[in-house]
C-alpha cells in the first residue's frame, strides 16, 4: 500500500512570445483545480480503462480576476498535494493524465460552470520510495510544471511497496529467517501480513492482504476442506488424492469493497459499486462533500455540504454510478436499424448507417443511394435524385475520403478557441459566451440565452464531440 503524490508548481503561459489570454476576467472571475488519473503503464487494457490505479481532484485554487491589459501571469494554484492512494503493489510503470479545469464564478444559473483548460498525458517509470521527479509539459499556449513521487505507507517498503518492515524486537539482530530492512537498518523485514482471518495452517500469501490455499483447502480464508465426496461439476482432475478440485477464490471473495460497496467480477479483476458518500477503487475514500468535486464526467454535485450529509451526483447522459464514473452502454439496446453501427458518444447516441439508409436510427431507406458508397463511415443522404454524403466527424469531401481536422471548420463561435482532445473537440469560449460551440451570449444580468440543459448538464459544462 502507498500513496502517489502530485505537486503542481505552476500553470502559466508557455515559453513563446504570444502569451495566452487569461482564462479569467473582471466580469468572470474564476479559479483553477486539477484532476489526475493514473493507470498501470503496461497493462493491455490500460489505454481504454478508467483510472485503474486511482484518481484525485485538487481543492479549488484562490479566486483570480484578470487585471485589464496585463499579460496572463502564472495562475494562483490550489494548496497542497494531489494524493492518490494505492492499496496493492506500485506497478513501477504508470500512465498519467493531468487535467487543468477552470471554475467560472460569474452569476451562472445553477452554480459555477466548469471548463477544461488543458490536458497532458504521459507514461513514466517510477520506483516507490524514490525522490520527487520533476516534469514540464506544454498544453496549447499553457505550460504546466509539476513533480510527483510514489511513497509506501508503513509498514510497506521497497520499490513496489510489497516488503514489510517492523521495528526490531531485539537490539542486535532480526528474528530467525528475517533480514534487516535496508535502508532502515534498525528495522527488520517482517513476515507478510496475509488477509485478516487467513488460516495460518492451510493458507499463505505472497502479497500483503491475499490468502492462497494449500492443496486440499479452499474458501476465501482457506478454512473449507475440499470435498472428498464425488463432485457434481468438477473443474478438472485434482492432483490431491482426496477428490475433486473446487474453484479457487474469486476476485470478489471476501468482498474487497469497503464501506458497504458491492463487488462484481470483471474479466480481469473486480469492480466496486460504492454507496453514496464513498468512492475510490474499493470505496475506501469517505467523508466526501461537493467541495471535493466527487462527480466525474461533468456530473453536477448537489447537497453534501458537510461530510455527514450525502452528496448526489446528477450525471450527464451516457454516464451512471454514484460518481458518474461508469459509461452507460446504450448501444446494447441495439437502437440502430437496418444494420447500422451504434456509437455511444457520451452526450448522445449516433447511428452510422449502411449505404442506402439514413435517419437518426437508420430508419429511412434511400433509393438514390443504392450502390453509392460514402467512405470512412459517411452516410449517404437522399437529395432529389442525386446522392450526397454526410461525413463522419474527422472526414470531408464529396465521398468522405478526405481527412479533416475537427477544428478546421472553426466550429467555435464568437472567437472561441478550438482544441482537439482525446474524446473530440472542446471549445474554450471567449468571455461573455458559453455553450458547446460558444454560440450563446451570457447576458449581463447573469441569465443566458442557453436553452434548458438536459438533466444533469448545466450551461457551461464542458461538452465534447467526437
Amino acid at each position: 500500500a502507498g500513496v502517489f503524490e502530485l505537486q503542481i508548481h505552476s500553470f502559466g503561459p508557455g515559453p513563446g512570445p504570444g502569451a495566452p489570454r487569461s482564462p479569467c476576467s473582471a466580469r468572470l472571475p474564476c479559479r483553477l483545480f486539477f484532476r489526475v488519473c493514473l493507470k498501470p503503464g503496461l497493462s493491455e487494457e490500460a489505454a481504454e480503462s478508467p483510472c485503474a490505479l486511482g484518481a484525485a481532484l485538487s481543492a479549488r485554487g484562490p479566486v483570480y480576476t484578470e487585471q485589464p491589459g496585463a499579460p496572463a501571469p502564472d495562475l494562483p494554484l490550489p494548496d497542497g498535494l494531489l494524493q492518490v492512494p494505492f492499496r496493492d503493489a506500485w506497478p513501477g510503470t504508470f500512465s498519467f493524465i493531468i487535467e487543468t479545469w477552470r471554475e467560472e464564478l460569474g452569476d451562472q444559473i445553477g452554480g459555477p460552470a466548469w471548463s477544461l483548460l488543458a490536458r497532458v498525458a504521459g507514461r513514466r517509470r517510477l520506483a516507490a520510495g524514490g525522490p520527487w521527479a520533476r516534469d514540464i509539459q506544454r498544453a496549447g499556449a499553457w505550460e504546466l510544471r509539476f513533480s510527483y513521487r510514489a511513497r509506501c505507507e508503513p509498514p510497506a517498503v521497497g520499490t513496489a511497496c510489497t516488503r514489510l518492515c517492523r521495528p526490531r524486537s531485539a537490539p542486535s539482530r532480526c528474528g530467525p529467517g528475517l533480514r534487516p530492512c535496508a535502508p532502515l537498518e534498525d528495522e527488520c523485514e517482517a513476515p507478510l501480513v496475509c488477509r485478516a482471518g487467513c488460516s495460518p495452517e492451510h493458507g499463505f500469501c505472497e502479497q500483503p492482504g491475499e490468502c492462497r490455499c494449500l492443496e486440499g483447502w479452499t474458501g476465501p480464508l482457506c478454512t473449507v476442506p475440499v470435498s472428498t465426496s464425488s463432485c457434481l461439476s468438477p473443474r478438472g482432475p485434482s492432483s490431491a488424492t482426496t477428490g475433486c478440485l473446487v474453484p479457487g477464490p474469486g476476485p470478489c471473495d471476501g468482498n474487497p469493497c469497503a464501506n458497504g460497496g458491492s463487488c462484481s467480477e470483471t474479466p480481469r479483476s473486480f469492480e466496486c459499486t460504492c454507496p453514496r458518500g464513498f468512492y475510490g477503487l474499493r470505496c475506501e475514500v469517505s467523508g466526501v462533500t461537493c467541495a471535493d468535486g466527487p462527480c466525474f464526467n461533468g456530473g453536477l454535485c448537489v447537497g453534501g455540504a458537510d461530510p455527514d450529509s450525502a452528496y448526489i451526483c446528477h450525471c450527464p447522459p451516457g454516464f451512471q454510478g454514484s460518481n458518474c464514473e461508469k459509461r452507460v452502454d446504450r448501444c446494447s439496446l441495439q437502437p440502430c436499424r437496418n444494420g447500422g453501427l451504434c456509437l455511444d458518444l457520451g452526450h448522445a447516441l449516433r447511428c452510422r448507417c449502411r449505404a442506402g439508409f439514413a435517419g437518426p436510427r437508420c430508419e429511412h431507406d434511400l433509393d438514390d443511394c443504392a450502390g453509392r458508397a460514402c467512405a470512412n463511415g459517411g452516410t449517404c443522404v437522399e437529395g432529389g435524385g442525386a446522392h450526397r454524403c454526410s461525413c463522419a466527424l474527422g472526414f470531408g469531401g464529396r465521398d468522405c475520403r478526405e481527412r479533416a481536422d475537427p477544428c478546421a471548420a472553426r466550429p467555435c463561435a464568437h472567437g472561441g478557441r478550438c482544441y482537439a482532445h482525446f474524446s473530440g473537440l472542446v471549445c474554450a469560449c471567449a468571455p461573455g459566451y458559453m455553450g458547446a460551440r460558444c454560440e450563446f451570449p451570457v447576458h449581463p444580468d447573469g441569465a443566458s440565452a442557453l436553452p434548458a440543459a438536459p438533466p444533469g448538464l448545466r450551461p457551461g459544462d464542458p461538452q465534447r464531440y467526437l
Epitope: 498525458a121 507514461r123 521527479a133 514540464i136 477544428c407
Partner: antibody, heavy 117, light 107 residues
Framework: QVQLQQSGPDLVKPGASVKMSCEAS????????IHWVKQKPGQGLEWIGY????????NYNVKFKGKATLTSDTSSSIAYMELSSLTSEDSSFYYC??????????WGHGTTLTVSS | DIQMTQSPASLAASVGETVTITCRAS??????LAWYQQKQGKSPQLLIY???SLEDGVPSRFSGSGSGTQYSMKINNMQPEDTATYFC?????????FGAGTKLELK
C-alpha cells in the same frame, strides 16, 4: 532571445572519450530540460536523453546508457555530454535542444564527431 | 519502445499545392506528438506540438491533426521555403522516438 551554442567539431581515436558542450543563453537555464539528439548524415533523428539542470536528474534512452553521460553546470549555464569507448558507429552529428519533457523548442547548431584512427 | 511509421518517405509538390504527411504510432500516444522541419544543413525546428498546437512564429499554412495512433500534418499552399525534411516525434513515453522523415521537394 534563446540560443544554444555547441562546441566545435571533434576528431578522436577509437576507444577514446569525448566531452561536448552546449552553452545556453536568453532564458533561465534551470527552467527547462536539455535534450541530446544524434543524427547520422542523411539519416533520421535518435533521442539520446535529457538532463534537468534544476536537480541534475537524467533520463536516458536505454540504447545510450553506458555510452553517454549527461551533466550540467548551472553557474555557467552549460550542459555537457560525454561519449565513451568511441567506435566508428559514434561518428555522427549531435544536437542539444532546450525543451519540456515532450517538446524540443530550441535547438543548437550541432557538433560533428568523427571517430577515426 | 513506441515505433513511429511516417509516410511518404518523399514527395514533390508545386507551389500552391496542399501537402499531407502522416505518422502512425505503434500504440495510443494521447496527442503527445510533435512535428519538426529540418532544412538542408540546418538544425531541426519545432512546428507543431500536442498534435495540433502551432508553435509561435510558424506560418498558419502548417496544421496538425489526429488522435490515438494516427496523426497527420498538412501544408496548405506549398511555398518554395517549405522544401525540407519533416519528422514526427512521439513523447508519450521514453525513449522519445522519431519517424524516419519525409523529404519534401519542389516540383
Amino acid at each position: 532571445q534563446v540560443q544554444l551554442q555547441q562546441s566545435g567539431p571533434d576528431l578522436v581515436k577509437p576507444g577514446a572519450s569525448v566531452k561536448m558542450s552546449c552553452e545556453a543563453s536568453g532564458y533561465t537555464f534551470t527552467a527547462y530540460f536539455i535534450h541530446w539528439v544524434k543524427q547520422k548524415p542523411g539519416q533520421g533523428l535518435e533521442w539520446i536523453g535529457y538532463i534537468d539542470p534544476f536537480n541534475d536528474d537524467t533520463n536516458y534512452n536505454v540504447k545510450f546508457k553506458g555510452k553517454a553521460t549527461l551533466t550540467s553546470d548551472t553557474s555557467s549555464s552549460i550542459a555537457y555530454m560525454e561519449l565513451s569507448s568511441l567506435t566508428s558507429e559514434d561518428s555522427s552529428f549531435y544536437y542539444c535542444a532546450r525543451g519540456t519533457s515532450a517538446t524540443l523548442d530550441y535547438w543548437g547548431h550541432g557538433t560533428t564527431l568523427t571517430v577515426s584512427s | 519502445d513506441i515505433q513511429m511509421t511516417q509516410s511518404p518517405a518523399s514527395l514533390a509538390a508545386s507551389v500552391g499545392e496542399t501537402v499531407t504527411i502522416t505518422c502512425r504510432a505503434s500504440e495510443n500516444i494521447y496527442y503527445s506528438l510533435a512535428w519538426y522541419q529540418q532544412k538542408q544543413g540546418k538544425s531541426p525546428q519545432l512546428l507543431i506540438y500536442n498534435a495540433n498546437s502551432l508553435e509561435d512564429g510558424v506560418p498558419s499554412r502548417f496544421s496538425g491533426s489526429g488522435s490515438g495512433t494516427q496523426y497527420s500534418m498538412k501544408i496548405n499552399n506549398m511555398q518554395p521555403e517549405d522544401t525540407a525534411t519533416y519528422f514526427c516525434k512521439q513523447a508519450y513515453d521514453v525513449p522519445l522516438t522519431f519517424g524516419a522523415g519525409t523529404k519534401l521537394e519542389l516540383k
